[in-house]
Structures are given as structure tokens and as C-alpha cells.
């Protein structure tokens, strides 16, 4: 939905650097098919995590570990010739500032890994 | 840090559903390895598309769209065998309500693909 | 068939120490990778620190590394991981792991409590 040319775009130097927000999610039922159950049929399977701080919103966030270093072959063993590396995203969160039972929030940006992925290896070859 | 034991956490019933929110952000310059190369070294490789939306807070998320039905061998070549799926994760986005140059947001939650593994498909044995 | 025997598990308080020790049945000269894996109580086994068959030697992530460090005795053929400035989290059962002609090899495991 195009903006008012006029308004100022979140983002922009100018925006108000304090703004309301209602925590009525909308969207809340999001058909959340995430991952399902790709972290164990994966060839680079993951196990989730439970990363759980009060202070922030949302407060339980799941972080993916890769199980093996390598990916797992048709024969259900690791090989080495590949990796299981983590794809991490940048999300938002609202953390309580200042902390203990306040209203205020400030956004903060987090580095999570959501889950993993096979890669060819980066080989470096010696002069 | 743990909370004072009489607060509400934020995702509680009788938390406020308005807050104040700074939108400074902590954390800007995240070490963002973000999948690094991982999209064109993946044997489940991906494109990254732009979504944009002034209205929403960010304005900017990348989407990744798998770039085959199957997974890349170590030939190169594309196996059927296996299937490439999108990783998808919720995330917490801030959406402007009502529209146009106001500073109240709403959360909105958003499902986006982060990027995509590599799994052994689910076989249906037809009776 | 290769056997892999751990020891050296126990319970400990948090910010303290533990070696844990892996006997090896076969030469872990000829492995393609040892190590560790661990599986945290209502997860699957995931792993902790590798060393390939180049010598690399490889950790998980950033909270194991710099904590823990794994070393292979090829005379003495076992392999040993030592946990320092332990946590909680690292609550696990530690199995022993090998890789032999293709072949993926776990220890029976032995558990690690950490006490907070």
C-alpha cells in the first residue's frame, strides 16, 4: 500500500524515535508450517533450542543447533566432503528498557539461526 | 536477568496492550553472517527476493524462494530423489494502524522463508 | 566391530571442570573424524567438537569453543574432551563418536550434569 508522499518513512532520520504499539498481534494464527518437520528429514538435520528471557518480547525464541558437522548420506551416515552450516536471520524484538515492569520497550535486533542447510565446504588452497 | 516476580510478562493477559517503543535500535550492527554465500553454495540453493512495504516496520524483507524442486548432487547435477524446502520462520514486524503518516504500529506477525535444506521426501504408499 | 568406551562423567558444579576419556577399539589413526556429539535431555544426539582426518579440529559453535577442547593420543588410542567453566546447559549425555570407511560409530555415552 503506497504511503502519503508526504509521510516520513519509519526508517528515515526524521521519524519519531518513540512511537506507540499495540501488542494485539494481528496475524496471529499465521499458518506456522515452520520447518515442520524438516529439522529431522534434513541432510543437515537440527535440533531446537529454547532461548527463554523475560525481559524481552517475544520471550521464548527457538534457536537451531546442526547435529553433525558434515551431512548425512542416503546411508544415514555424516560425510565430511560437505557441510551442515546454520541459516541465521536478523529478526526484532522488543526488549524492557528500562528493565523490571515498565511499559517502555526498545527495539533491539537479534541474530537467530532458524535452521540448517547442506553447503559445498570453502576449500583454500596453500600456495 | 530474571524478572521481578510481580510483574506481568509482556505476553500476558493483564500486560498493557499499548506501549511506548523506542525505535533506536540495540544491536544494529549485528554481526550479520546471514547466510553469507550458503544460497549458492547449498545443494538446496536459493534466491533472495525483495519485499517491501512502506507501511511496515522494517520496510525491507528479504524472501527466499528455493531455486529447484530437487537437491544438487555432488555432479552438480538436480536429484529428485530428495526435495529442497524453504526453512520458514515467524517473525515480529511493526505495521502502521491506522495507515498513513501516524506514529501508532501494530504488531503483525509475517511468515517468511529464510532460506532452504535439503530433505528426504515423505513417500505416500498408495493402498 | 569397533567399540568406543567412555568415562570420566559425573555431576559438577557450575564454572567447574570435567575431562572426559574414550577408548577406542580401532586405530583412531585411520578415522576419517573423532570426536564428540552430545544429547541434551528431549533432543537428539548433536555434536560438539571434531577432528577431521587432516587434523582440522573443529566446535560447534562459539559457547563450546574456547570452554572445550578435544584431543586425540593416537599412541594410546583415545580421544578426550575437557570441559572447562562448565554450565547448566551443557547438561548432556557426552557419547564418544568415530567415522571409519564411511561408517558412523557412538560410545554407549556417559552423562554430565551441571549443577547450578
Known amino acids: 500500500s503506497p504511503q502519503n508522499p508526504g509521510c516520513p518513512n519509519a526508517e528515515d532520520k526524521n521519524f519519531p524515535r518513540t512511537v506507540m504499539v499495540n501488542l494485539n498481534i494481528r496475524n496471529r494464527n499465521t499458518n506456522s508450517k515452520r520447518a515442520s518437520d524438516y529439522y529431522n528429514r534434513s541432510s543437515s538435520p537440527w535440533n531446537l533450542h529454547r532461548n527463554e528471557d523475560p525481559e524481552r518480547y517475544p520471550s521464548v525464541i527457538w534457536e537451531a543447533k546442526c547435529r553433525h558437522l558434515g551431512c548425512v548420506d542416503a546411508d544415514g551416515n555424516v560425510d565430511y566432503h560437505m557441510n551442515s552450516v546454520p541459516i541465521q536471520q536478523e529478526i526484532l524484538v522488543l526488549r524492557r528498557e528500562p528493565r523490571h515492569c515498565t511499559n517502555s520497550f526498545r527495539l533491539e535486533k537479534m541474530l537467530v539461526s532458524v535452521g540448517c542447510t547442506c553447503v559445498t565446504p570453502i576449500v583454500r588452497h596453500v600456495a | 536477568s530474571p524478572q521481578n516476580p510481580g510483574c506481568p510478562n509482556a505476553e500476558d493477559k493483564n500486560f498493557p496492550r499499548t506501549v511506548m517503543v523506542n525505535l533506536n535500535i540495540r544491536n544494529r550492527n549485528t554481526n550479520s553472517k546471514r547466510a553469507s554465500d550458503y544460497y549458492n553454495r547449498s545443494s538446496s540453493p536459493w534466491n533472495l527476493h525483495r519485499n517491501e512495504d512502506p507501511e511496515r516496520y522494517p520496510s525491507v524483507i528479504w524472501e527466499a524462494k528455493c531455486r529447484h524442486l530437487g537437491c544438487v548432487d555432488a555432479d552438480g547435477n538436480v536429484d529428485y530423489h530428495m526435495n529442497s524446502v524453504p526453512i520458514q520462520q515467524e517473525i515480529l514486524v511493526l505495521r502502521r494502524e491506522p495507515r498513513h503518516c501516524t506514529n501508532s504500529f501494530r504488531l503483525e506477525k509475517m511468515l517468511v522463508s529464510v532460506g532452504c535444506t535439503c530433505v528426504t521426501p515423505i513417500v505416500r504408499h498408495v493402498a | 566391530e569397533v567399540q568406543l568406551v567412555e568415562s570420566g562423567g559425573g555431576l559438577v558444579q557450575a564454572g567447574g571442570s570435567l575431562r572426559l576419556s574414550c577408548a577406542a577399539s580401532d586405530s583412531v589413526f585411520t578415522a576419517k573424524a573423532v570426536g564428540w556429539y552430545r544429547q541434551p535431555p528431549g533432543l537428539q544426539r548433536e555434536w560438539v567438537a571434531i577432528i577431521t582426518s587432516g587434523g582440522k579440529t573443529n566446535y560447534a559453535d562459539s559457547s563450546v569453543k574456547g570452554r572445550f577442547t578435544v584431543s586425540v593420543d593416537k599412541v594410546k588410542n583415545t580421544v578426550t574432551l575437557q570441559m572447562n567453566s562448565l554450565k547448566p546447559e551443557d547438561t548432556a549425555v557426552y557419547y564418544c563418536?568415530?567415522?571409519?570407511?564411511?561408517?558412523?560409530?557412538w560410545g554407549q555415552g556417559t552423562q554430565v550434569t551441571v549443577s547450578s
Open positions: 563418536y568415530a567415522q571409519w570407511m564411511g561408517r558412523d560409530y
